[in-house]
């Protein structure tokens, strides 16, 4: 079990998909919309999980994802039989400092070139996605086809 160095603050980044849509917070829901003037895309807060020994290896870097400065984190939970993506009021550093991984808030971050995917740790095979139509909420999907976009561009701010 490698001991990760303790980090005091999460990294910050911006996200857009291959259609240059950005993530915007609307009524406590994240939606993907084309970038426009006077628009305020969310800044993502992300931090690696300190406890990787109980998580699958070689699936990606397990990270917590939040909205910077808003005390909101992305999590996956079942509604009925369907895994869904939700925003929960949670301090990302509280998750990071736990003595155990909190799988429902964790995502395997994989990078291929400039593209990033975010796979749910709690529901393997389910990825953060946006509908190809745009203006739609972020979702979790198993279907990695044309209907949904699961590839995102992640730009680290600092």
């Amino acid at each position: 079990m490698e001991k990760a160095l303790k980090i005091d603050t999460p990294q910050q980044g911006s996200i857009q998909d291959i259609n240059h849509r950005v993530w915007v917070l609307q009524d406590q829901t994240l939606i993907a919309v084309p970038r426009k003037d006077r628009m305020s895309p969310v800044t993502i807060a992300l931090i690696s999980c300190r406890h990787v020994e109980t998580l699958e290896k070689d699936r990606g870097n397990p990270i917590y994802l939040g909205l910077n400065g808003l005390n909101l984190c992305l999590m996956c939970a079942k509604v009925g039989d369907q895994p869904t993506l939700q925003l929960k009021e949670k301090d990302i550093m509280d998750l990071y400092n736990q003595p155990e991984p909190v799988k429902s808030f964790l995502f395997y971050h994989s990078q291929s070139g400039r593209n990033s995917t975010f796979e749910s740790v709690a529901f393997p095979g389910w990825f953060i996605a946006v509908s190809s139509e745009g203006g739609c909420p972020l979702i979790l999907t198993q279907e990695l086809g044309k209907a949904n976009t699961t590839d995102f561009g992640l730009t680290m701010l600092f």
């Epitope: 079990m1 001991k3 020994e53 109980t54 509280d94 736990q98 003595p99 909190v102 799988k103």
Partner: antibody, heavy 121, light 111 residues
Amino acid sequence: QLQLQESGPGLVKPSETLSLTCTVSGGSIGSRSYYWGWIRQPPGKGLEWIGSIHYSGTTYYNPSLKSRVTISVDTSKNQFSLKLSSVTAADTAVYYCARVAPSYPRVFDYWGQGTLVTVSS
Amino acid sequence: QSVLTQPPSVSGAPGQRVTISCTGSSSNIGAGYDVHWYQQLPGTAPKLLIYGNRNRPSGVPDRFSGSKSGTSASLAITGLQAEDEADYYCQSYDYSLRVYVFGGGTKLTVL
């Protein structure tokens, strides 16, 4: 066979600091995969996790006790220790040390025999 | 009041089957955390009995079995024997409280 043995005073006065040491034999406290923990059990009651430590020095404490607890490790002696300050009668309990093994969540797979600490003047 | 709820006591005659339940919530067992079980014989330290919901450490008889569903778990003991008389504790982790949590314990009496 891994063995853990608690040692320390059996009687502590109110407001003083409780100090216990756990000596590990039959295995190395410096194993990368394990944490080492303290759990207590008041007489006739259930179990309460106090905190855990990794040989690297990383510690996790029960938030309800965090302001009073310090756990440290001495890899050269294969020991880890507990200090609990400002004790009251409510801290009277059998104190156990245990190995904390990887699982989801972690599991206490080897336990010491326990030592009764009474807080009384 | 324990975060994980167990019945205070259960009983059974030798040879019978008994079950002990452990009920949690969405921030512990329901969040996907496994449940571990410990046996504490009178006057002794707890001993790991079941880990990861259903796995037995070496030396634990297959009369002991565990299961988990949703926000609860259970321990089953078949072919009850006099030496099974003990306190049994379930354990998991609660991410809201940030603590390893134990059930209040269940005293098993073999009649």
